[in-house]
């Protein structure tokens, strides 16, 4: 009796089970009662990453330098090219189809996590006792200067954007 379901790595066509093409190969012709499925390797710059019955291979992704992209991992007949962003940029999506400049943390905010090729800078507000007076993609919040350790006193209180100002202690006359 003709099959109604096929084994893994097979597909049903014309009431018979044919072998799927292995990753890196495309379908040329379905199997028959006399011949196996005919498959051909994908060409240069093409790939198929699953057992398949595709008649065309997929084109490798192009990492467009005009979009800030560069090749992180070259594609093979079985894998797509993986793109990442140039230094100072990160992907706008998981698919990494384009890049944007890393965000800088404004004064009053410090870098919690430095950006990577796939994730943006994560900023955090400087808590009490810390400050940031620059807009930066790398600088963390710095602790206020400890005047006491320098035998000085606070002349001007610090904020999240400014350090404390230390001065000499008032001398007893």
């Amino acid at each position: 009796e003709p099959p109604t379901a096929c084994r893994e790595k097979q597909y049903l066509i014309n009431s018979q089970c044919c072998s799927l093409c292995q990753p890196g190969q495309k379908l040329v012709s379905d199997c028959t009662e006399f011949t196996e499925t005919e498959c051909l390797p994908c060409g240069e710059s093409e790939f198929l990453d699953t057992w398949n019955r595709e008649t065309h291979c997929h084109q490798h992704k192009y990492c467009d330098p005009n979009l800030g992209l560069r090749v992180q991992q070259k594609g093979t007949s079985e894998t797509d090219t993986i793109c990442t962003c140039e230094e100072g940029w990160h992907c706008t999506s998981e698919a990494c189809e384009s890049c944007v400049l890393h965000r800088s943390c404004s004064p009053g905010f410090g870098v919690k996590q430095i950006a990577t090729g796939v994730s943006d800078t994560i900023c955090e507000p400087c808590p009490v006792g810390f400050f940031s007076n620059v807009s930066s993609a790398f600088e963390k919040c710095h602790p206020w200067t400890s005047c006491e350790t320098k035998d000085l006193v606070v002349q001007q209180a610090g904020t999240n954007k400014t350090d404390v100002v230390c001065g000499p202690q008032d001398r007893l006359r």
Partner: antibody, heavy 117, light 107 residues
Framework: EVQLVESGGGLVKPGGSLRLSCAAS????????ISWVRQAPGKGLEWVSS????????YYPDNVKGRFTISRDNAKNSLYLQMNSLRAEDTAVYYC??????????WGQGTLVTVSS | EIVLTQSPATLSLSPGERATLSCRAS??????LHWYQQKPGQAPRLLIY???QSISGIPARFSGSGSGTDFTLTISSLEPEDFAVYYC?????????FGGGTKVEIK
């Protein structure tokens, strides 16, 4: 027991025609594709034609395409090969063979076709 | 068309010896190859299918190996009834083709 018995061979002049038959028994004929394979005297095996189990698909090599026609009658458990415009190089023993697991798993004993003037 | 080249054309051996027959395809055919044995005056008989799969009723001394373009039929210890002609056949694509055969004869 699977059996395939060929008949219809004989002597024929170049340009002539001949119809070979293959009678099958011992298995469900309509479930299997069948092929014809020939062997010229003292030579190797050469595939001639194949037909799918339902008879809807037929296959030929270029050297017999347009001259030979394969057919089957599942009700009669029979396979046929109509050979027209025969040439001296078609002289051979013709075997019918069942296709099981894409292999020719059972063969008949063959029938001799001689094309000569 | 896929061309199958069998070597050697003739193999002269004595009973009990090991026979190694080669079949080379002109392009890759994965494991889509069968082996047949033919004795004089008889029809061919299927020995091995899918390059290495054994057939019920065929003695265990017959084994097949290989994939891609290079295939081997091995007869581990020749019996008198093994002296015959052996053919490989590809079923990777149309047209179906056979190798030219290897004759295993008594030395």
């Amino acid at each position: 027991e699977v059996q395939l018995v060929e008949s219809g061979g004989g002597l024929v002049k170049p340009g002539g025609s001949l119809r070979l038959s293959c009678a099958a028994s011992g298995f469900t004929f309509s479930n299997y594709g069948i092929s014809w394979v020939r062997q010229a005297p003292g030579k190797g095996l050469e595939w001639v034609s194949s037909i799918s189990s339902g008879g809807d698909n037929t296959y030929y090599p270029d050297n017999v395409k347009g001259r030979f026609t394969i057919s089957r009658d599942n009700a009669k458990n029979s396979l046929y090969l109509q050979m027209n415009s025969l040439r001296a190089e078609d002289t051979a023993v013709y075997y019918c063979a069942r296709a099981g697991e894409k292999a020719m798993d059972y063969w008949g004993q063959g029938t001799l076709v001689t094309v000569s003037s | 068309e896929i061309v199958l080249t069998q070597s050697p054309a003739t193999l002269s051996l004595s009973p009990g010896e090991r026979a190694t027959l080669s079949c080379r395809a002109s392009q890759t055919i994965n494991n889509n190859l069968h082996w047949y044995q033919q004795k004089p005056g008889q029809a061919p008989r299927l020995l091995i299918y899918y390059a290495s799969q054994s057939i019920s009723g065929i003695p265990a001394r017959f084994s097949g190996s290989g994939s891609g373009t290079d295939f081997t039929l091995t007869i581990s210890s020749l019996e008198p009834e093994d002296f015959a002609v052996y053919y490989c056949q590809q079923f990777s694509s149309w047209p179906l083709t056979f190798g030219g055969g290897t004759k295993v004869e008594i030395k």
